[in-house]
Structure formats: C-alpha cells, structure tokens
Interface confidence: medium
C-alpha cells in the first residue's frame, strides 16, 4: 500500500489508477477507516450521506473534502480499463495536525543550587499524533534521570476533536557553581516523519548559590590558652548568623551544664579546667554548628607557653570515655 | 559535604521504646567517635552517650545507664541509639555527633523523641 499523509480539514485526493478519464467508468472504491464498521463501497453513482466525507469524481479520483482523524485507514479502487484490463489501487491514510507553538508556563525565575527545582512546564495543544515534548539546555538535549534532571508527562485527548495536549514539568538540580544564567527550552516532535520540530521561546532562569554556613569562630583570651594557676580563661563564640542562635560549650566533647552564653569565663583556673573547649551554635533552620577546638593548658611558673594558637586539641581525645 | 541524617524519632507511651539511627556521608565515618546529645524544651544541650571509632568503648550519661544502648555499622556508616524503658524525661530533640582529634564536631539536623502518655 501507498502511504498517504494528509492534514486535518484539508481535502485530499486520492488516483483510482488505470481508470477511464471519464465516465463511463468500470470502478468502485473500498473504504475500512475510522467511519467504517468493515469494507464500504463507493461507486461513481454516488449519492446519500457519504457524499459529504467521499466521493467519486468524473474522473475516478476519490474526494475527501475535509480530512478527519476517522478517515485514517486503508482506501482501494479497483478499475476496469475499456479493454477489460483490471488495475488496483492501494493506499494506507494516515492524518496529522501540527500543534500551535509550544509554551513554557509556571517558568522559574530563581532556581537554587545543589537541590532539586521545578523550571517550568512545557504545554504543547492540538497534535495529532501525540507526538513528544523534549527539553533543552543550552541548545542540548536534557536526558531525563540523569545528572539530576527528572521529567514528569501527561497526555491528554480533547473529548470532541480527538487532538492531544501534552504537558511535560521539568525538573533539574543544578550544579554548584555551574552557569549562572542558563537557557532553557522545550520543543515538540511530531508523531509522524517529515515534519520539523516547533521549540519555545527559551527562559533564562537565574541561578541562586546558597552561601555556605559561616563558620562558627571560638577566640579564646589569654591567646594560646595557656594560664598561670588561679588566672582567667575568657572564651568567646562569634557566630555571624542572624538571628542570633543559642550558643552552647563543651568540654572535651561534653556539653557544659550551663545556659546557653556567646561568652564563657573560667576564672581561678585549676588543674580540672584543663582541657579541649569548643562551642556549639543551635538554630532554629538547621543542625547545630561547632567551632574548632581550643586546649586550655595551666602553665606552672619558670615553664614556656604554648605556641599561640594551639587549636585542635584532642578533640574527642577523652570524650568522657572512661 | 559531611552530612549527618538521624532518624527514628517519633512519639512513644512511658516504658515504650525507640531506635535511633544516624547515617554518615561525606566523611571517613570509621575514623571518629560518634555521640548523642539531646537538648530538652527549654534547656541546654546534654550529652547522652558516646561510643569510640572502632567500637570497642561506650560511655553514657548516668540518667541512660542500663536503658541505652549505643552502637555503630562501620560497614554501613551509621551509629544507633536504642532507647529503652523511656521516661517522660527523655523527651528532646536528638543530635548525633561526630568527632575526631584537630576537627570541629559535625551535627546532624536533630530527630524528635516525645515520651509521653
């Protein structure tokens, strides 16, 4: 059979080959389409309700005035020369329509680095076929399920005409420091080859890189941490977050049983202050925060300090772990 | 990124139990001792139980004792808490803590735990 392809509401023409230019003519028309519960026939005669889907012209030639989504199907004349030669005519009509444009709808302006967004839904109306909805970035095609790209469809039929709308919702995690203005778009593939893809306008969504946590600062006076016996030990926690959160202490990675203070003071040090001091930052939006640890060290008179700044200590050397 | 997940949290009656876990990404999990501090409404952090890299030692706070247990899945990068005989005051958010020698400790977001009947 001959593939056909004809646009809906446009009228086609089909050749009843090896038939008489014109009447009288030995020929009839074989119908099994969308309109048809089996084979109908249709002879030059013509008449009734069928005239206005089909009909025979003075030629032979099959007329469809305006195509439809039932008139996919299978059409075959037989025609019978005047020197009583018989010749077939076979063809497979498939039907299409090219949507409108694609859009992208609900487009994101702002989308946030490191976790999953929404960039917008495509919506193509009035395909058929189907046909697909595909989605790029930068020109290139965006492969669903990976490098954090996932891609949700819906098809949907019109009741009436029987056209299809499609919905295609993007989502991507874009990479830290990646572009900062990437350019997305959609476009539609028609079902049927031969017929040229129709892109949206591309978005431009900005890209928002959250600002890592700050860290939490522990400045410890005198610097060092060394003390002579009886002296004072002031350690202070800066936490640049706002608001403020609730500033906690620990010693060798136990929480202090004090209230929650930005300011620690250990006066007349002893032998049982010494130790790794840290401090532990809760806010309301995330997990806690701790700062470096200090060592807090009793200097005896005669002795040499520690080099300034001996951060780290054991950390969770003792941890309580007796 | 060091990430810290705990899970398990949840509402249980009085002498009911709970098992927490916290899951460890983004660090060599096996190289720190891990612990569990909790901060009840309206107080300040308590630490509640520690075990040490390998496993071998475990520690707890004296309200715990004999009702917690701890323990870790090196394999798995996860430690667990489990939380038996629960009083009413065991209610707090439950933080795992992960820490080792010249390293600021690493926090998890914290999992509920409300013991009540």
């Known amino acids: 059979a001959q593939n056909i392809t004809a646009r809906i509401g446009e009228p086609l023409v089909l050749k009843c080959k090896g038939a008489p230019k014109k009447p009288p003519q030995r020929l009839e028309w074989k119908l099994n389409t969308g309109r048809t519960e089996a084979w109908k026939v249709l002879s030059p005669q013509g008449g009734g309700p069928w005239d206005s889907v089909a009909r025979v012209l003075p030629n032979g030639s099959l007329f469809l005035p305006a195509v439809g989504i039932q008139d996919e199907g299978i059409f075959r004349c037989q025609a019978m020369n005047r020197n009583g030669k018989e010749t077939k005519s076979n063809y497979r009509v498939r039907v299409y329509q090219i949507p409108g444009k694609p859009e992208i709808v609900d487009s994101a302006s702002e989308l946030t680095a490191g976790v999953p967004n929404k960039v917008g839904t495509c919506v193509s109306e009035g395909s058929y076929p189907a046909g697909t909805l595909s989605w790029h970035l930068d020109g290139k095609p965006l492969v669903p399920n990976e490098k954090g790209v996932s891609v949700k469809e819906q098809t949907r039929r019109h009741p009436e005409t029987g056209l299809f709308t499609l919905q295609s919702e993007l989502m991507v995690t874009p990479a830290r420091g990646g572009d900062p203005r990437p350019t997305f778009s959609c476009s539609f593939s028609p079902g049927l080859p031969r017929h040229r893809a129709l892109r949206t306008a591309p978005i431009q969504p900005r890209v928002w890189e959250p600002v890592p946590l700050e860290e939490v600062q522990l400045v410890v006076e005198p610097e060092g941490g060394a003390v002579a016996p009886g002296g004072t030990v002031t350690l202070t926690c800066e936490v640049p977050a706002q608001p403020s959160p609730q500033i906690h202490w620990m010693k060798d990675g136990v929480p202090l049983p004090l209230p929650p203070s930005p300011v620690l003071i250990l006066p007349e040090i002893g032998p049982q202050d010494q130790g790794t001091y840290s401090c532990v930052a809760t806010h309301s939006s995330h997990g806690p925060q701790e700062s470096r640890a200090v060592s807090i060290s009793i200097i005896e008179p005669g002795e040499e300090g520690p080099t300034a700044g001996s951060v780290g200590g054991s950390g969770l050397g003792t941890l309580a772990l007796a | 990124a060091v990430q810290l997940v705990e899970s398990g949290g949840g509402l249980v009656q009085p002498g009911g139990s709970l098992r927490l876990s916290c899951v460890v990404s983004?660090?060599?999990?096996?190289?720190?001792?891990m612990s569990w501090v909790r901060q009840a409404p309206g107080k300040g952090l308590e630490w509640v139980s520690a075990?040490?890299?390998?496993?071998?030692?475990?520690s707890y706070a004296g309200s715990v004792k004999g009702r917690f247990t701890i323990s870790r899945d090196n394999a798995k990068n996860t430690v667990y808490l489990q939380m038996n005989s629960l009083e009413p005051e065991d209610t707090a958010i439950y933080y795992c803590?992960?820490?080792?020698?010249?390293?600021?400790?690493?926090w998890g977001q914290g999992t509920q735990v409300t013991v009540s009947s």
């Open positions: 803590n992960a820490r080792r020698v010249g390293s600021p400790g690493s």
């Open positions: 983004g660090f060599t999990f096996r190289s720190y001792a």
């Open positions: 075990i040490t890299s390998g496993g071998e030692s475990t």
